[in-house]
């Protein structure tokens, strides 16, 4: 018998510790950093992944501003507070009692304040625009082939319901993937667009979160699609609240 048969791993999250101590001795995996039990049949929430990643380099992601309500993450990595379901808590604070409010993908959406700062609710990021530039190729990709391949990727690799991939735009060498998911649209068991975007971002950077699976090998009609830069724009259901000086 192979030793691999006799141990536990989490196919969807390698940043876990797993052992057969779940109900009935089933495999149970806990996220590093938080010890929270994760469901390995789906993506792990970004909050738990960020918590597990705290020892990683600082340049987590870059955000740009498509309109006056979009957020840019100038703060880099931080050790987030997650709720029992693994979602970001609306209010985040650092060790020096500086606090701020975040959206559902953990990006700051208010000015920083002190412990008296109130964040009444976790505001949902309902629209994500993933902006990619691919490396030069002999010719442009066929738009419909590219569209189909990216939709397949989000459905099969990230388990995101196809209805949440709103559009795939292409103007060589720029590809834009639009993800949309309102609170009312997200049913129990649905993968969150924020988590899918985070897994995709890590894949594109060659930092796959999947256990033992090869890195992302994107091909359109057999032609490799190699991404050379990624920008992700986040839009919240309620516009952020920053003072004018920002």
């Amino acid at each position: 018998h192979t030793a691999a048969q006799d141990n536990c791993t989490c196919p969807t999250n390698k940043m876990t510790v797993c052992s057969p101590d779940g109900p009935g001795g089933r495999c149970q995996c806990r996220a590093l950093g938080s010890g929270v039990a994760v469901d390995c049949s789906t993506l792990t929430s970004e909050c738990l992944l960020l918590k597990a990643r705290m020892s990683a380099p600082k340049n987590a992601r870059t955000l740009v501003r498509p309109n006056e309500h979009a957020l840019v993450d100038n703060d880099g990595l931080y050790d987030p507070d997650c709720d029992p379901e693994g979602r970001f808590k609306a209010r985040q604070c650092n060790q020096t009692s500086v606090c701020w409010c975040v959206n559902s993908v953990g990006v700051r959406r208010t000015d920083k304040g002190d412990l008296s700062l109130r964040c009444d609710e976790l505001v949902r990021t309902h629209h994500i625009l993933i902006d990619l530039r691919h490396r030069p190729t002999a010719g442009a990709f066929n738009h419909s082939d590219l569209d189909a391949e990216l939709r397949r990727l989000f459905r099969e690799r990230y388990r995101l319901h196809p209805k949440f991939v709103a559009a795939v735009h292409y103007e060589q060498p720029t590809i834009q993937i639009e993800l949309r998911q309102n609170t009312s649209q997200k049913a129990a068991g649905d993968v969150d667009i924020g988590d899918a975007a985070y897994y995709f971002e890590r894949d594109v950077k060659g930092e796959s979160l999947f256990q033992g699976r090869g890195g992302l090998d994107l091909r359109v009609r057999g032609e490799p699609l190699q991404v050379e830069r990624t920008l992700i724009y986040y839009l919240d259901e309620i516009p952020p609240k920053f003072s004018m000086k920002r």
């Epitope: 536990c8 057969p20 101590d21 109900p23 009935g24 001795g25 089933r26 149970q28 039990a37």
Partner: antibody
Framework: EVKLVESGGVLVKPGGSLKLSCAAS????????MSWVRQTPEKRLEWVAS???????YYPDSVKGRITISRDFARNILYLQMTSLRSEDTAMYYC?????????WGQGTLVTVSA | DIVMTQSPLTLSVTIGQPASISCKSG???????????FNWLLQRPGQSPKRLIY???MLDSGVPDRFTGSGSGTDFTLKISRVETEDLGVYYC?????????FGSGTKLEIK
């Protein structure tokens, strides 16, 4: 050597309550998932309750609300609290240590529910 | 609930001869985590059940290698290459992939 010793099984009237105990030794109790399994007089085996390492509890619908699994880490004892007992709860109750299933079994304690 | 159907109900075997027990589940036991939570247990007369095999084919420590577990999905088999006296008793299959966990009704192995 893993050792599980159940106790507390008695004759009880329908509607009554009972608390079973299982003394565990020979392994790290706090790191282990544990369960209770019962065997009816007809020799049918039935899963009754499980508790994970993180102390999450799991029950089949047939006993939910009437049965509670818990443990005492200081004394290395697993418990099964049973209330509103019925004649169909009559069985030999086994405590198990779990690893990919019910890996180790105790000798059992007999619970008889009868008027 | 997942029904585990064992066959035969009784198996009469001569010492030294092979034996085979089947267990079929009402649904695939392959879990989303890639594991198949399927066990074989033996309850000797007057004793508690004892696990022989877990994850379909993995032998528990101290279990003789004349026992072999195989199968996948919904069909599982326990084979004993040469039956010995200590093998008599009731064999149960178990699934832990779906809640609630369920057992087969048992196969009684008796010596001919």
């Amino acid at each position: 050597e893993v050792k599980l010793v159940e106790s507390g099984g008695v004759l009880v009237k329908p509607g009554g309550s009972l608390k079973l105990s299982c003394a565990a030794s020979g392994f790290t109790f706090s790191d282990s998932a544990m369960s209770w399994v019962r065997q009816t007089p007809e020799k049918r085996l039935e899963w009754v309750a499980s508790i994970s390492r993180g102390d999450d509890t799991y029950y089949p619908d047939s006993v939910k609300g009437r049965i509670t699994i818990s443990r005492d880490f200081a004394r290395n004892i697993l418990y099964l609290q049973m209330t509103s007992l019925r004649s169909e709860d009559t069985a030999m109750y086994y405590c198990t240590r779990d690893r990919f299933g019910f890996a180790y079994w105790g000798q059992g304690t007999l619970v008889t529910v009868s008027a | 609930d997942i029904v585990m159907t064992q066959s035969p109900l009784t198996l009469s075997v001569t010492i030294g001869q092979p034996a085979s027990i089947s267990c079929k589940s009402g649904q695939s036991l392959l879990d989303s985590d890639g594991k198949t939570y399927f066990n074989w247990l033996l309850q000797r007369p007057g004793q508690s059940p004892k696990r022989l095999i877990y994850l379909v084919s993995m032998l528990d420590s101290g279990v003789p290698d004349r026992f072999t577990g195989s199968g996948s999905g919904t069909d599982f088999t326990l084979k004993i290459s040469r039956v010995e006296t200590e093998d008599l008793g009731v064999y149960y299959c178990w699934q832990g992939t779906h809640f609630p966990f369920t057992f087969g009704s048992g196969t009684k192995l008796e010596i001919k």
